[in-house]
């Protein structure tokens, strides 16, 4: 019996065709991704093949203006559009909180929304019953499939799943729910989560019962081939783990952003053994068009999105220096702004040990783009915003040892005075340049803002001490030359998207002053 | 759980030919097809062709082609094989099995002799 | 056709020891191919599928590598209840083929 497996992960807000690196479409016809075209692929193989999945791995909510104005709504409608048969929950689906999940999203989705590992207690017990289920048996052709949701356990840490949810170890919640499967004689089990994937690998490897892991949260891109595009194979698709029990399980995962369309064909057998396994991600690119029907609703829903950019979020009554001339050189107003509202997006007292989990920023100065003037009434708007930060990039968690961002500051000034972009502007760090020292040996102090305290306070940076830090995603993934985050990290996930993060932190302000103030020296 | 039951032992003359049925239970019948696989005395396995239940598509195996006709009666969920022109080199066990040959008949011994 | 060439056809071995049986196939059949044990009187049982999957419940001392036109079965460590003969099936065209069968006897 022959299953195609369609799947989605990561999507972030992509609901329009983006440009190749998933930022906004500029020229239509070197554009890519988007629910309109991703339809019109589905549909074409909903026709030509008999049992077909379509699965969305978690990561719909957060990544454009889309999500910030509509907060979900905008996801269960096209999902619902486009005939979605699951999805597990990721951790960007709890951003708005627990109600911003219930309201526009598990009310109105007509499929089931799925995580195992995540229990709710308290008074949200009764409110959020059956709204999302551990997994889903689902009616395919003749036979049925069973599908079980999985999601990121550092969910607490990455989004605001609030205090009545609790997340679970994956493997140690999923192993009883594909048990009882088994017990209602469902052989054919699709793991489908939002962990990563060495946490898909393992799920693959240590649940007994699992067949085929559909993956996310890693934008994870595997291929088998030639790759289509710019993105670099993790390894082959479907990526095949051995289980503990000796079991061939794939393991697939397809990128982010709606770029690609997972595309996997399994064989099982009467007993539900994956006797094969093929297919690859299907770049969805402009020799597929998109569906009219789909993208005359887009552009109906794109109404209110224009109206919104000219909406004042709050206000500043200083200037806001995002020039290049300052924060490629110095301190700037603006990255201070910038690193003080990724810190406050990432507010979670989740230990009484630490006042946060995080309380360090860096940011490139080249990826500030434009000030923004307060003389205009104060007034800033989304508009404004999309000048200072125009990449669309997220602002990322992730872990490094204290050699590795000395390493960082010392090439933030190797070339010191060219006004290159990887000069950093910082939060929570108070960092001391000696230009007149060689570079490689230009940072003399290097402080700190503890997290570990009830009083934050700074202290000198540990070599071999783990920090967590908010950085762009550009960072993450070794920007400007800073190649030693890239290698050396310990952890990367995902973050909120960069306008959306400031925009929300000016919003809640509503007028703003930041100042210069002696960060960097 | 799958099971496979076949029909019972056969004696049969030179040039008459033998229907043996296959019985399935324990899965969804009409997702899947049926092999038949035949065993010679002393013998390794031969695979005779398969049967998709759920249209009655066939495929033989060209030794087996024009002699063996595979059939299903999707309300029974049983499968049969008939072999013709039967001849001394017939005698075998024959058993049906699953797909992927993960299930197997009990086995039916059909005897060819004058 | 595909031919199937499995070696050896018989061996004598004693409990506990290392057995390895090989298939052969006269061209690449990918990952479709299974091994199957028969003990005399009774229908075939596949142990493998897929080359390498271990079918439920079969012990862990067997094991299914290989790929492209040779494959491998191979039993850790050979039980009692292990001396049967041995057949792999390819199913990467039509029509499917065994092997010719690895008898395993008590030495």
């Known amino acids: 019996w022959e299953l195609t497996i369609l799947h989605t992960n990561d999507v972030h807000s992509r609901l329009e065709q983006t440009s190749e690196d998933s930022s906004k479409c500029v020229n239509a016809s070197r554009c890519m991704g988007g629910v309109a075209r991703l339809f019109t692929k589905v549909q074409q193989i909903r026709r030509a093949e008999p049992n077909v999945l379509l699965l969305d791995a978690g990561d719909q909510y957060q990544g454009t203006i889309w999500f910030t104005v509509y907060k979900g709504a905008e996801v269960a409608h096209f999902m619902n559009a486009l005939r979605y048969d699951a999805m597990a929950l990721g951790n960007h689906e709890f951003d708005n909180g627990v109600e911003g999940l219930i309201e526009p999203l598990l009310k109105e989705a007509k499929f089931p929304i799925l995580s195992a590992n995540i229990k709710a207690k308290g008074p949200l017990a009764s409110q959020i019953s059956g709204l999302y289920l551990p997994y889903k048996v689902l009616p395919v052709g003749d036979e049925v499939v069973g599908i079980v949701g999985y999601t990121s356990k550092e969910t607490p840490f990455l989004s605001n799943p609030g205090t009545n949810l609790v997340f679970e170890d994956e493997i140690t919640a999923l192993q009883p729910e594909v048990d009882k499967l088994k017990t209602l004689n469902v052989n054919k089990i699709i793991a489908l989560g939002h962990s990563g994937f060495e946490m898909d690998k393992l799920i693959a490897q240590k649940v007994r019962g699992v067949d085929v892991v559909v993956g996310g949260h890693s934008n994870t891109f595997l291929y088998t081939g030639n790759p289509p595009s710019k993105e670099v194979p993790a390894g082959k698709y479907p990526f095949i783990v051995t289980s503990d029990d000796g079991r061939k399980v794939p393991v697939v995962q397809a990128y982010a952003f709606g770029k690609y369309l997972g595309y996997l064909k399994i064989e099982f057998d009467e007993r539900g053994n994956v006797i094969s396994s093929h297919g690859n991600p299907i770049l969805l690119n402009s020799s597929i068009p998109e569906d009219p029907s789909i993208k005359a609703d887009i552009n109906k829903w794109r109404i209110k999105l224009d109206n919104y950019s000219t909406q004042e979020l709050g206000k500043t009554i200083v200037y806001l220096d995002g020039s290049s001339q300052s924060c490629r050189f110095r301190e700037c107003n603006m990255g201070n702004l910038i690193c003080d509202a990724m810190i406050n997006n990432n507010l979670r007292h989740t230990d009484e040990m630490f006042w946060n989990h995080v309380s360090m920023c860096i940011l490139n100065g080249g990826g500030i783009r434009s000030p923004i003037d307060e003389r205009n009434n104060g007034t800033i708007t989304w508009e404004n915003l999309a000048a200072v930060l125009p990449f669309g990039g997220t602002f990322d968690l992730v872990q490094l040892k204290g050699s590795t961002l000395k390493k960082a500051f010392e090439h933030s000034v190797h070339r010191y005075g060219q006004s290159t972009g990887e000069f950093l502007q910082v939060g929570g760090i108070h960092v001391v340049y000696d230009l007149s020292r060689k570079p490689g040996d230009r940072v003399v102090k290097l402080d700190v803002l503890c997290t570990k305290c009830r009083v934050p306070s700074y202290d000198p940076l540990k070599m071999d001490e783990v920090y967590k830090v908010i950085l762009p995603n550009f960072l993450a993934n070794g920007g400007d030359g800073f190649q030693m985050i890239k290698d050396e990290l310990l952890r990367h996930d995902s973050g909120d998207q960069d306008i959306n993060v400031v925009s929300t932190y000016i919003s809640k302000m509503k007028v703003i002053y930041p100042a210069v103030e002696g960060r960097i020296k | 759980e799958v099971q496979l039951v076949q029909s019972g032992a056969e004696v049969k003359k030179p040039g008459a030919s033998v229907k043996v049925s296959c019985k399935a239970s324990?899965?969804?019948?009409?997702?899947?097809?049926m092999n038949w696989v035949m065993q010679a005395p002393g013998q390794s396995l031969e695979w005779i062709g398969r049967?998709?239940?759920?249209?009655?598509?066939?495929f033989y195996s060209q030794k087996f082609k024009g002699r063996a006709t595979l059939t299903v009666d999707k309300s029974t969920s049983t499968v049969y094989m008939e072999l013709r022109s039967l001849r001394s080199e017939d005698t075998a066990v024959y058993y049906c099995?699953?797909?992927?040959?993960?299930?197997w008949g009990q086995g039916t011994t059909v005897t060819v002799s004058s | 056709d595909i031919q199937m060439t499995q070696s050896p056809s018989s061996l004598s071995a004693s409990v506990g020891d290392r057995v390895t049986i090989t298939c052969r196939a006269s061209?690449?059949?990918?990952?479709?191919l299974n091994w199957l044990q028969q003990k005399p009187g009774k229908a075939p049982k596949r142990l493998i599928y897929?080359?390498?999957s271990l079918d439920s419940g079969v012990p862990s001392r067997f094991s299914g590598s290989g790929s492209g036109t040779e494959y491998t079965l191979t039993i850790s460590s050979l039980q009692p209840e292990d001396f049967a003969t041995y057949y792999c099936?390819?199913?990467?065209?039509?029509?499917?083929?065994f092997g010719g069968g690895t008898k395993v006897e008590i030495k």
């Open positions: 099995a699953t797909s992927y040959v993960g299930d």
């Open positions: 324990g899965y969804t019948f009409t997702a899947y097809f």
């Open positions: 049967i998709y239940h759920n249209n009655g598509d066939t």
């Open positions: 061209q690449d059949i990918g990952d479709s």
């Open positions: 897929a080359t390498s």
């Open positions: 099936l390819q199913y990467a065209s039509f029509p499917w083929t």
